[in-house]
């Protein structure tokens, strides 16, 4: 393990922090979990706790940001450099920041909470087996009522459990609706919608109206980000993949490798690639927040990186579902910190 | 010992282009970002280019925006600087350094070693 | 982008004299400023990272002081090797940007 200079660290043991704001890649309670867990990790190991306040004096700030987002350390867009960190002290020493051109997951793909169905809630499991084929995103697959539906296990076929996905046609959000879900078509502005729009809105958030005549009704919902199928890169960054659609006269209601020579995975953005050319990849398998954001807590508290490749702090993103801290990494914070003390003995107690 | 070795500079017409090199050594320098910086005669300090580590993310001055191209060969140890349309006003000592911080260790501030420059010069 | 003022633009000091050299930012830039000395002819050399870290081989006379807009660079005791320019530089913001300079020089 390494520290940086002088043992940079903190003075007191009671750290707070703040999430300044949120990445749209998951949910804001995942997000919650995801650093609550990461911090838990060191205060197993240390006298330290670690406290969520909701104001700009906390000791860690977290925020998400791209590009340059206001300290002297740009960010370099997906991959490369996926978070930074800045050692103990005031201000924005102690900071960590997120690279929000990343895929932010738990390093297993993204993260789609399901509805409804028969899986209490838990989030989708990609791929899954349906009938056979694999699926890398929600799917209309096997419904009449075009409602997009995800296995919360890898085999659909033997397991059976499935929920609904984020979609307009279930339900909307914030908006004046109480969550009723899209009435397609409507009317705005004397115009047919048959989709979400952006249009009348500058900040590019997509809405639907959950009656037929918004012009009339007023009445109007935000549409859930679809993360599973929401493109990066290709020609339409940002789009939503159209299932069916079809290439080489081919129908695909999945995210397909055909056509590449790289194995990488892509839908049209549009039903009919042949002739609109309009695509991008499909979502990866995304980098751990939970685990990127331990290694820069480690930073946040006073660790430099460290030369042992199995540590949480050695400078290289890698995926494990095993404990994330190797005995460097606690030698190294208890050097700082000290151990976590033993809890007092108690007298035995009489009835 | 840290060690920076530039080369290429010399006298080139406006409108020319020149490829300067930065040859690294005692150090791991894929695991740092790079930077050129360029003092004109008798002037200050302006930083010109940065590439991050990984070697994909690349930042330029405005002055330079469009007309330089900075990069980078980690298995040479080796930095560049290619510039093409060049200007007088390009006239200046180029000295590539080396940043203290790497990937996401930051806040540490401060350029640890310098190249000895190389000096170009843009006149007709 | 932070500009950064360098004050005074010259100063003559005599060796054994304690010099102060300052550096103002246009706004806060916490203490992300590194100061450097630059001799004719020669490559700038880091002396002060992060407003007050000593670099590596810097002598104990060099000190550096300062967070927000205001910063100083001192050397207690001048040494004859110590006559040069000096800037300061930051990185609280994006872009970097390099102070315009201090000459320290002889009286």
């Known amino acids: 393990f390494q520290t940086f200079e002088g043992d940079l660290k903190w003075h007191h043991h009671n750290i707070t922090y703040w999430i300044q704001n949120y990445s749209e890649d998951l949910p804001r309670a995942v997000i919650d979990d995801a650093f609550a867990r990461a911090f838990a990790l060191w205060s197993a190991v240390t006298p330290l706790t670690f406290t969520r306040v909701y104001s700009r004096d906390a000791d860690i700030v977290i925020q998400f940001g791209v590009a340059e987002h206001g300290d002297g350390y740009p960010f370099d867009g997906k991959d490369g450099l996926l978070a930074h960190a800045f050692p103990p002290g005031p201000g924005i020493q102690g900071d960590a920041h997120f690279d929000d051109d990343e895929l932010w997951s738990l390093g297993k793909g993204v993260v789609v909470p399901t509805r409804f169905g028969n899986a209490d809630g838990a989030a989708c499991h990609f791929p899954f087996i349906f009938e056979g084929r694999s699926y890398s995103a929600c799917t209309t697959d096997g419904r009449s009522d075009g409602l997009p539906w995800c296995s919360t296990t890898a085999n659909y076929d033997t397991d059976d459990r499935f929920g609904f996905c984020p979609s307009e046609r279930l339900y909307t959000q914030d908006g004046n609706a109480d969550g009723k879900p899209c009435q397609f078509p409507f009317i705005f502005q004397g115009q047919s919608y048959s989709a979400c729009t952006t249009d009348g809105r500058s900040d590019g958030y997509r809405w639907c109206a959950t009656t037929a005549n918004y012009d009339r009704d007023k009445l109007f919902g935000f549409c859930p980000t679809r993360a599973d199928s929401t493109v990066m890169g290709g020609n339409s960054a940002g789009e939503l993949c159209v299932f069916p659609f079809t290439f080489l006269g081919k129908e695909y209601s999945t995210c397909t490798s055909e056509g590449r020579g790289d194995g990488r995975l892509w839908c049209a953005t549009t039903s009919n690639f042949d002739s609109d050319k309009k695509w991008g990849f499909c979502p990866d398998q995304g980098y751990s927040l939970f685990l990127v954001a331990a290694h820069e807590f480690g930073h946040a508290l006073g660790l430099d990186h460290s030369s042992v490749p199995e540590a949480l702090m050695y400078p290289m993103y890698r995926f494990t579902e095993g404990p994330p801290l190797h005995k460097d990494d606690v030698n190294g914070i208890r050097h700082l910190y000290g151990p976590r003390p033993e809890p007092e003995p108690r007298p035995p107690t009489t009835t | 010992e840290v060690q920076l070795l530039e080369s290429g500079g010399g006298l080139v017409q406006p409108g020319g282009s020149l490829r300067l090199s930065c040859a690294a050594s005692?150090?791991?320098?894929?695991?740092?970002d790079m930077w050129w910086v360029r003092q004109a005669p008798g002037k200050g300090l302006e930083w010109v280019s940065?590439?991050?580590?990984?070697?994909?993310?690349?930042f330029y001055a405005d002055s330079v925006k469009g007309r330089f191209t900075i990069s980078r060969d980690n298995s040479k140890n080796t930095l560049y600087l290619q510039m093409n349309s060049l200007r007088a006003e390009d006239t200046a000592v180029y000295y590539c350094?080396?940043?203290?911080?790497?990937?996401?260790?930051?806040?540490?501030?401060?350029?640890?070693?310098w190249g000895q420059g190389t000096l170009v010069t843009v006149s007709s | 982008e932070i500009v950064l003022t360098q004050s005074p633009a010259t100063l003559s000091l005599s060796p054994g004299e304690r010099a102060t050299l300052s550096c103002r930012a246009s706004?806060?830039?916490?203490?992300?400023l590194a100061w450097y000395q630059q001799k004719p002819g020669q490559a700038p050399r880091l002396l002060i990272y992060?407003?007050?870290y000593r670099a590596t081989g810097i002598p104990a006379r060099f000190s550096g002081s300062g967070s927000g807009t205001d910063f100083t660079l001192t050397i207690s005791s001048l040494e004859p090797e110590d006559f040069a320019v000096y800037y300061c530089q930051q990185r609280g913001n994006w872009p970097i940007t390099f102070g315009q300079g201090t000459r320290l020089e002889i009286k």
């Open positions: 706004q806060s830039i916490s203490s992300f």
């Open positions: 005692g150090f791991t320098f894929s695991w740092y």
């Open positions: 940065v590439i991050y580590s990984s070697g994909g993310p690349t």
């Open positions: 350094a080396k940043d203290r911080a790497y990937g996401d260790y930051v806040g540490w501030n401060g350029f640890d070693y």
């Open positions: 992060d407003a007050s």
